[in-house]
């Protein structure tokens, strides 16, 4: 079943997917779609990867991490109601049906009226715990079960401090991640 | 250490073609991708598209798609760049550059640039 | 294409100053961001990539910052050597797009 990931109207969600590369610069490609992940590729792509740069997205949807070192999460901007639903991050290994799929479940829930005293963060999601192995063929990734919600709208730094800090490895550790190699 | 020398000036018609080399020295040719940017007379850079040398992978800016072709002949590490069709407004200096993995591909090192006058 | 604004076309300075050239992205480009300086007659030199990682080389008072959008890179004591035309480049997309770039020149 997928993973369910949850923000408010108005502000940005995120969808966690990492791949760790075999070498530095060996990239894969990477697409992100509308709906669950069908047997090839991403349906309804909103964004895509190729071995070096972003060459396709659409309006709102943008990779705020290090894609180049293999964080592919997904920032959705400024999302609506229609937003909620399935989305597929294909990390797409060369070879016949070596690719990774993940199904992450966003739900958007209508925004509180409630003044906000600080600075707001973007989302509140529940990480997963992933584990992955390391073996001659694809890799495997088994969910551990979950963690308690992380609400993020407590913590008053912005993206980029995050990213430095000992949460945003939580976060690396305990989003859709596989190892590639 | 790495250089980077390209084809010297070039005059050409509108409606011509131009091909522009760009001979790399002092790093492992196939390890980085080679970029292609130009600057018209007192303006910006704009990227025209990249090869990457080690499986021929191009990638194209679609403002030039069609017109604009870039090969690599390792045995000599050279990489070029081919624009046709030509009109006024490709009178430019046209760069190569290298990008790699490690600086997240940005151009570090350029070649001295190639003066091309497209003039009836 | 995501556009790269550098709105000051050209910037007075003097030796010994604190300067600070912007740059603004049309849409989020994380921090995927360079900085190159440009003398008359030259190519581009690379100073500063993935928003605030100075290239190889590079003086320590050429400093970059920021994430998202906006992007600065601050020269901390300027020097004469240092007028010359820089030009910020995102590196997220492609196709890479240029600012239109920022001629520093002296009071």
């Known amino acids: 079943s997928e993973v369910e990931y949850r923000a408010e109207v108005g502000q940005n969600a995120y969808l966690p997917c990492f791949y760790t590369p075999a070498a530095p610069g060996n990239l894969v490609p990477v697409c992100w779609g509308k709906g669950a992940c069908p047997v090839f590729e991403c349906g309804n792509v909103v964004l895509r990867t190729d071995e070096r740069d972003v060459n396709y997205w659409t309006s709102r949807y943008w990779l705020n991490g290090d894609f180049r070192k293999g964080d592919v999460s997904l920032t959705i901007e400024n999302v609506t109601l229609a937003d909620s639903g399935i989305y597929c991050c294909r990390i797409q290994i060369p070879g016949i049906m070596n690719d990774e799929k993940f199904n992450l479940k966003l739900v958007i829930k209508p925004a509180k009226v409630t003044p906000a005293p600080t600075r707001q963060r973007d989302f509140t999601a529940a990480f997963p715990r992933m584990l992955t192995t390391r073996g001659h063929g694809p890799a495997e990734t088994q969910t551990l079960g979950s963690l308690p919600d992380i609400n993020l709208t407590q913590i008053s730094t912005l993206a980029n401090e995050l990213r430095d800090s000992r949460l945003a490895n939580d976060l690396r550790d305990s989003g859709a991640t596989i190892r590639i190699g | 250490q790495v250089q980077l020398v390209q084809s010297g000036a070039e005059v050409k018609k509108p409606g011509a073609s131009v091909k522009v080399s760009c001979k790399a020295s002092g790093y492992t040719f196939t390890d980085y991708y080679m970029d292609w940017v130009r600057q018209a007379p007192g303006q910006g850079l704009e990227w025209l598209g990249y090869?990457?040398?080690?499986?021929?992978?191009?990638s194209y800016n679609q403002k030039f798609k069609g017109r604009v072709t870039m090969t690599t002949d390792k045995s000599t590490s050279t990489a070029y760049m081919e624009l046709r069709s030509l009109r006024s407004d490709d009178t430019a200096v046209y760069y190569c550059?290298?990008?790699?993995?490690?600086?997240?591909?940005?151009?570090?090192?350029w070649g001295q640039g190639t003066t091309v006058t497209v003039s009836s | 294409d995501i556009v790269m604004t550098q709105s000051q076309k050209f910037m007075s300075t003097s030796v010994g100053d604190r300067v600070s050239i912007t740059c603004k992205a049309s849409?989020?480009?994380?921090?995927?961001v360079a900085w190159y300086q440009q003398k008359p007659g030259q190519s581009p030199k690379l100073l500063i990539y993935?928003?605030?990682n100075r290239y190889t080389g590079v003086p320590d008072r050429f400093t970059g910052s920021g994430s998202g959008t906006d992007f600065t890179l601050t020269i901390s004591n300027m020097q004469s050597e240092d007028l010359a035309d820089y030009f910020c480049q995102q590196h997220y997309s492609s196709p890479s797009t240029f600012g239109g770039g920022t001629k520093l020149e002296i009071k």
């Open positions: 993935y928003a605030s």
């Open positions: 550059a290298r990008s790699g993995y490690g600086n997240y591909y940005t151009m570090d090192y």
């Open positions: 090869i990457y040398p080690n499986n021929g992978g191009t």
């Open positions: 849409q989020s480009v994380g921090n995927n």
